[in-house]
């Protein structure tokens, strides 16, 4: 950008230097260098010179016209052509940004995951912006009506030891920057009902040769929380539509979950959990894969998800790796 | 509605010094670069020097190296100092505002009513 830059006289934008994107703008320049009458006056954008719409106010002083400025950043400068001078002297320069003001933060979410010792509050900042754009998270407590706010750039995680103020609290965003500002709505929370239980993970699977083969999936979670509500969901990696299974868990030992599945298929499986009756899911588990066997059983292992094929009567996958998973619709 | 009041001018010898200063009132939303011109007694208004929100300062060569722009954001106030001066800086003096951004509440260019400089010899 342009800063520093030892000035001869005067570069401005009208109407502002930050604009909305779309506006259309004047920059102007004043010549203030001694022994110079410029002869001409130039402009340069991103160092780049401007040959159009240029327009010779008076002897000192020209204007630059933009329809329509779409950048959201530009370093401008302009200089003159003075007479005995072999080189364009330079005037000034300006960093100028176009975008556009805040849209209001809707879908304000605050969860506590489990063990984290955080309050993580979230929300849909709207679109774009293109310009620096604060956001200001104020927490008031509905019992001893103390307000703390936090600033951030994105989302906020607060100490849940910094929540002294009991259990109830409203939680709200503004949105703010140098073209306008905005507030969203209140969210009311209790942080008992806010956790999300610690992350469940599927560790491994097997088919078992019976009558009807069938596949266990072993999955696991370390929350300490009694009653939690999981869902599991898988298909077969060529399919679009997954398939959901419910379970009401108590995670004192490993759950084993069965499920009958056609043969020499590759599938994907995934579980997420929530304490049960409460608002937030976890977000869906890393996928695993699992391919079932044509006659034989198999035992594949997540770290190595090429489909690896084993002799003997029982073949498993194992999960020691992490995979991303498809984490739309997270919380809720 | 922004206002201007400059004030620091006067009378003063050849070599003297004066310090002007520009203080701004009535604004909330808005943020401005502040820019000093002069105008002198049948001449045409000339700028003389600006400050940027960022700090950042220009000058016209006439006055390079004896004059000085300033800021005070808690007093919303921009000042120059003006060092050896000379009978050419004779002329009313006025700050003008620029604003950084354009934002739903409608920021404009406000200018002061000026401040008289004499520079005897």
């Known amino acids: 950008g342009i800063t520093n830059i030892n000035c001869s006289g005067h570069i401005w934008v009208e109407p502002a230097t930050i604009f909305k994107m779309g506006m259309n703008i004047s920059i102007y320049c004043q010549a203030a260098i001694k022994n110079c009458q410029p002869r001409k006056l130039h402009f340069y954008k991103n160092g780049i010179k401007e040959r159009f719409q240029i327009t010779r106010i008076n002897k000192t002083t020209a204007r630059l016209w933009y329809k329509n400025f779409l950048e959201p950043h530009a370093s401008m400068y302009c200089t003159a052509e003075c007479p005995k001078h072999f080189q364009e002297t330079l005037i000034c320069g300006k960093d100028i940004s176009s975008g556009y003001p805040p849209d209001i933060p809707d879908e304000v979410t605050c969860v506590i995951y489990e063990y984290s010792g955080n309050m993580t509050c979230t929300w849909n900042a709207g679109k774009l912006t293109y310009i620096d754009t604060k956001y200001v998270v104020h927490v008031k407590s509905l019992e001893t009506e103390e307000e703390q706010q936090y600033l951030t750039s994105s989302y906020i995680n607060i100490s849940t030891d910094s929540l002294q103020g009991g259990k109830k609290y409203l939680v709200w965003v503004q949105a703010a920057n140098a073209l306008g500002m905005e507030e969203s709505k209140q969210l009311q929370i209790h942080l008992d009902d806010i956790v999300i239980p610690s992350a469940a993970v599927i560790s491994r699977a097997e088919t078992i040769n019976a009558t009807v083969p069938k596949t266990i999936i072993y999955w696991d979670s370390q929350t300490t929380i009694e009653k939690v509500s999981c869902e599991m969901r898988y298909k077969a990696t060529t399919n679009q539509t997954w398939n959901v299974k419910e379970f009401d868990t108590n995670f004192t030992y490993v759950q084993q979950s069965e499920f009958y599945l056609e043969p020499n298929i590759k599938y994907v499986f995934q579980v997420r959990c929530q304490e049960t009756g409460k608002r937030y899911w976890q977000p869906w588990s890393s996928l695993f894969f699992h391919k079932t066997p044509e006659t034989v059983p198999q035992v594949t292992s997540k770290a190595f998800q090429h489909d690896t094929w084993n002799s003997g009567l029982t073949v498993a996958s194992i999960s020691t790796g992490h995979l991303t998973s498809d984490n739309r619709g997270d919380i809720g | 509605q922004v206002q201007l009041q400059e004030s620091g001018g006067g009378s003063v010898q050849a070599g003297g010094s004066l310090r002007l200063s520009c203080a701004a009132s009535?604004?909330?939303?808005?943020?401005?670069?502040m820019t000093w011109y002069r105008q002198a007694p049948g001449k045409k208004r000339e700028f003389v020097s600006a400050i940027d929100s960022d700090g950042s300062t220009s000058y016209a060569d006439s006055v390079k190296g004896r004059f000085t722009i300033s800021q005070d954001n808690a007093k919303n106030t921009v000042y120059l100092q003006m060092n050896s001066l000379k009978p050419e800086d004779t002329a009313m003096y006025y700050c003008?505002?620029?604003?950084?951004?354009?934002?739903?509440?409608?920021?404009?260019?406000?200018w002061g009513q000026g401040t008289q400089v004499t520079v005897s010899s």
């Open positions: 009535g604004y909330t939303y808005c943020s401005y670069d």
């Open positions: 003008k505002t620029d604003p950084i951004a354009t934002i739903s509440r409608r920021c404009d260019s406000y």
